[in-house]
């Protein structure tokens, strides 16, 4: 058993049929010694008396808010949550496996630049009685500070018969050094509580590996005289790290016909312009990627040819 | 051509070669074995590689003030990785495939380090750790980790030379 926060405790249980469970001793936070009784949740049934209560925690029915009273007055509370371990593996019932980039990916994180700011998100099908708490650091043995905000519900989607809820959180490294080569990964830890079930999820990454620039901005076409060719130009996204002579991007320009089956013409360039042939009803799209490190491409910025 | 006693490096040449290094490091990476080695042996096998850290002056401001500190750091790293790529980790069993870019990568690391330090001008270099894996799986894992680490190192070096070529070239 360990303390998650004041008056909230997590009991770690090996979860299998007829498991013995864990013996837990609760102590009433009071100077009083006599006439103390204990109840669980809203029930008025007295579970025991005395300053301490010893219980055997085996299942969710044994978890909940234990309250000690004296003469009708509440003295203190202890909320017990359960953390299940099945076959030596902690349960992951609350969050959905996003399966990208690999199986057992529950948290996904992205950064728009090298400033030390990043966003993580996760998915669940649970709509109520759900709380999240996020902590982060750079490195684990001698951790350096990363400050995370509160996790918020950022999207709701319907997937078949189910509703899916996306939560996200923004974090900022306290003393970020955008130009340095990271040697210690960022660690992100999410505590998830659904009703009386506790679970924790972790992710470890370098900012360089989660970089995904915003799409190029101000995408424009300039027809070239007496030609089917056009000059496409664009600019670095505002959110990208500066100076651009140091934090350079590379770009992919694509000409795509109306039909997805039509052959795509692609050009790669380090410049912020390119000359391409504009076909009727086609569109021109441009996306960006760090020039020197193959992290994710941005989403496409697009304009119609006509 | 290089930086003896604090003169400027051939920024544009260094930029071109460092960008080539980035491409080679990424093309070599999947070919050293296979991709899913991350879970195997979480112990840090490449702890001793030289990293370009915050105080090394490789940021735009540091380069403007005095690029020597940063260039020395980059040179140390290039020599270190060049030695690793020529070591038993990469030459031992299992042999690399005939079309592996590791050989080109090795030569390019040497080429860039020579651009930075001509004959007769010596910066101290970091000792290469005595990593001598005895089993094939250990070698494959080390190759994977070294190339991952090299990718990050050459990305910073390439940024430095690109910025230098754009803003510090005579």
């Amino acid at each position: 058993i360990w303390e998650l926060k004041k008056d909230v405790y997590v009991v770690e249980l090996d979860w299998y049929p007829d498991a013995p469970g864990e013996m837990v001793v609760l102590t009433c936070d009071t100077p009083e010694e006599d006439g103390i009784t204990w109840t669980l949740d809203q029930s008025s049934e007295v579970l025991g008396s005395g300053k301490t209560l010893t219980i055997q925690v085996k299942e969710f029915g044994d978890a909940g808010q234990y309250t000690c009273h004296k003469g009708g007055e509440v003295l203190s509370h202890s909320l017990l949550l359960l953390h299940k371990k099945e076959d030596g593996i902690w349960s992951t019932d609350i969050l959905k496996d996003q399966k990208e980039p690999k199986n057992k990916t529950f948290l996904r994180c992205e950064a728009k630049n090298y400033s030390g700011r990043f966003t993580c998100w996760w998915l669940t099908t649970i709509s109520t009685d759900l709380t999240f708490s996020v902590k982060s650091s750079r490195g684990s043995s001698d951790p350096q500070g990363v400050t995370c905000g509160a996790a918020t519900l950022s999207a709701e989607r319907v997937r078949g018969d189910n509703k899916e809820y996306e939560y996200s959180v923004e974090c900022q490294e306290d003393s970020a050094c955008p130009a340095a080569e990271e040697s210690l990964p960022i660690e992100v830890m999410v505590d998830a509580v659904h009703k009386l079930k506790y679970e924790n999820y972790t992710s470890s990454f370098f900012i360089r590996d989660i970089i995904k620039p915003d799409p190029p901005k101000n995408l424009q076409l300039k027809p070239l005289k007496n030609s089917r060719q056009v000059e496409v130009s664009w600019e670095y996204p505002d959110t990208w790290s500066t100076p651009h002579s140091y934090f350079s991007l590379t770009f992919c320009v694509q000409v795509q016909g109306k039909s997805k089956r039509e052959k795509k013409d692609r050009v790669f360039t380090d410049k912020t312009s390119a000359t391409v042939i504009c076909r009727k009803n086609a569109s021109i799209s441009v996306r960006a990627q760090d020039r020197y490190y193959s992290s994710s491409w941005s989403e496409w910025a697009s304009v119609p040819c006509s | 051509r290089a930086v003896p006693g604090g003169s400027s490096p051939a920024w544009t040449q260094c930029q071109q070669l460092s960008q080539k290094l980035c491409t080679l490091a990424w093309s070599a990476h999947p070919l050293v074995g296979h991709m899913d080695l991350r879970e195997e042996g979480d112990e840090e096998t490449t702890n001793d590689v030289p990293h370009i850290q915050c105080g090394d002056g490789c940021d735009p401001q540091g380069l403007r003030d005095n690029s020597q500190f940063c260039l020395q750091r980059i040179h140390q790293g290039l020599i270190f990785y060049e030695k690793l790529l020529g070591s038993d980790i990469f030459t031992g069993e299992p042999s690399l495939l005939p079309d592996s870019p590791v050989g080109q990568l090795h030569a390019s690391l040497l080429g860039l380090s020579q651009l930075l330090q001509p004959e007769g001008h010596h910066w101290e270099t970091q000792q290469i750790p005595s990593l001598s894996p005895s089993q094939p799986w250990q070698r494959l894992l080390l190759r994977f980790k070294i190339l991952r680490s090299l990718q990050a190192f050459v990305a910073v070096a390439a940024r430095v030379f690109a910025h230098g070529a754009a803003t510090l070239s005579p």
């Epitope: - | 074995g33 195997e40 299992p94 042999s95 495939l97 005939p98 089993q135 094939p136 799986w137 494959l140």
Partner: antibody
Framework: EVQLQQSGPELVKPGASVKMSCKAS????????MHWVKQSHGKSLEWIGY????????NYNQKFKGKATLTVNKSSSTAYMELRSLTSEDSAVFYC????????WGQGTTLSVSS | DIVMTQSPATLSVTPGDRVSLSCRAS??????LYWYQQKSHESPRLLIK???QSISGIPSRFSGSGSGSDFTLSINSVEPEDVGVYYC?????????FGGGTKLEIK
């Protein structure tokens, strides 16, 4: 085209030694380790060891230490395996092979040990 | 040493059949496993590396799967020319060791 040409069959008496060769062509000889594999008649394959032609350093299967000696001649791009104190147990086909990923094998040298 | 055990020792099949050959390692070798085919009076030929990665020039009917200590070589539609002995090999640790082989025959 990569080729590994092995020396011809050997018939030797018990207690004798034999040295078989594997001439490589079609690639840079020093770039890849050369392995040796034993296959007794109707049996499976046994890895004897390999030699790094660049530095001449061998790595043996413990079982064949003292039995096999691997050497190379860089100038002729040839690898050699010497087997000593031969017994009937050593009768087998011996293959030289470039490392597993490269998958090039010699045609095999048949060794018969008989009095 | 890592012991590689193959089963069955012999497999008799009809052309067009899908067959599975099994290989078990005495300890986990992750996916450092190679499969070879050896036809009569020929040298072995590599079919699969790293348990499931195909080799150029090898027909697509050959595929490999497994990780840890249990591995399978599948031939999804056996051809008469597939007769021979199939060996698995540990590529994880020295000494490299081979399985005893599975002999594939056509009925």
């Amino acid at each position: 085209e990569v080729q590994l040409q092995q020396s011809g069959p050997e018939l030797v008496k018990p207690g004798a030694s034999v040295k078989m060769s594997c001439k490589a062509s079609g690639y840079t000889f020093t770039a890849y380790n050369m392995h040796w594999v034993k296959q007794s008649h109707g049996k499976s394959l046994e890895w004897i060891g390999y030699i790094n032609p660049n530095n001449g350093i061998p790595n043996y299967n413990q079982k064949f230490k003292g039995k096999a000696t691997l050497t190379v001649n860089k100038s002729s791009s040839t690898a050699y395996m010497e087997l000593r104190s031969l017994t009937s147990e050593d009768s087998a086909v011996f293959y030289c092979a470039l490392n597993w990923d490269l998958d090039y094998w010699g045609q095999g040298t048949t060794l018969s040990v008989s009095s | 040493d890592i012991v590689m055990t193959q089963s069955p020792a012999t497999l008799s099949v009809t052309p067009g059949d899908r067959v599975s050959l099994s290989c078990r390692a005495s300890q986990s070798i992750r996916d450092y496993l190679y499969w070879y085919q050896q036809k009569s009076h020929e040298s072995p030929r590599l079919l699969i590396k790293f348990a499931s990665q195909s080799i150029s020039g090898i027909p697509s009917r050959f595929s490999g799967s497994g990780s840890g200590s249990d591995f399978t070589l599948s031939i999804n539609s056996v051809e008469p020319e597939d007769v021979g002995v199939y060996y698995c090999q540990n590529g994880h640790s020295f000494p490299y060791t081979f399985g005893g082989g599975t002999k594939l025959e056509i009925k």
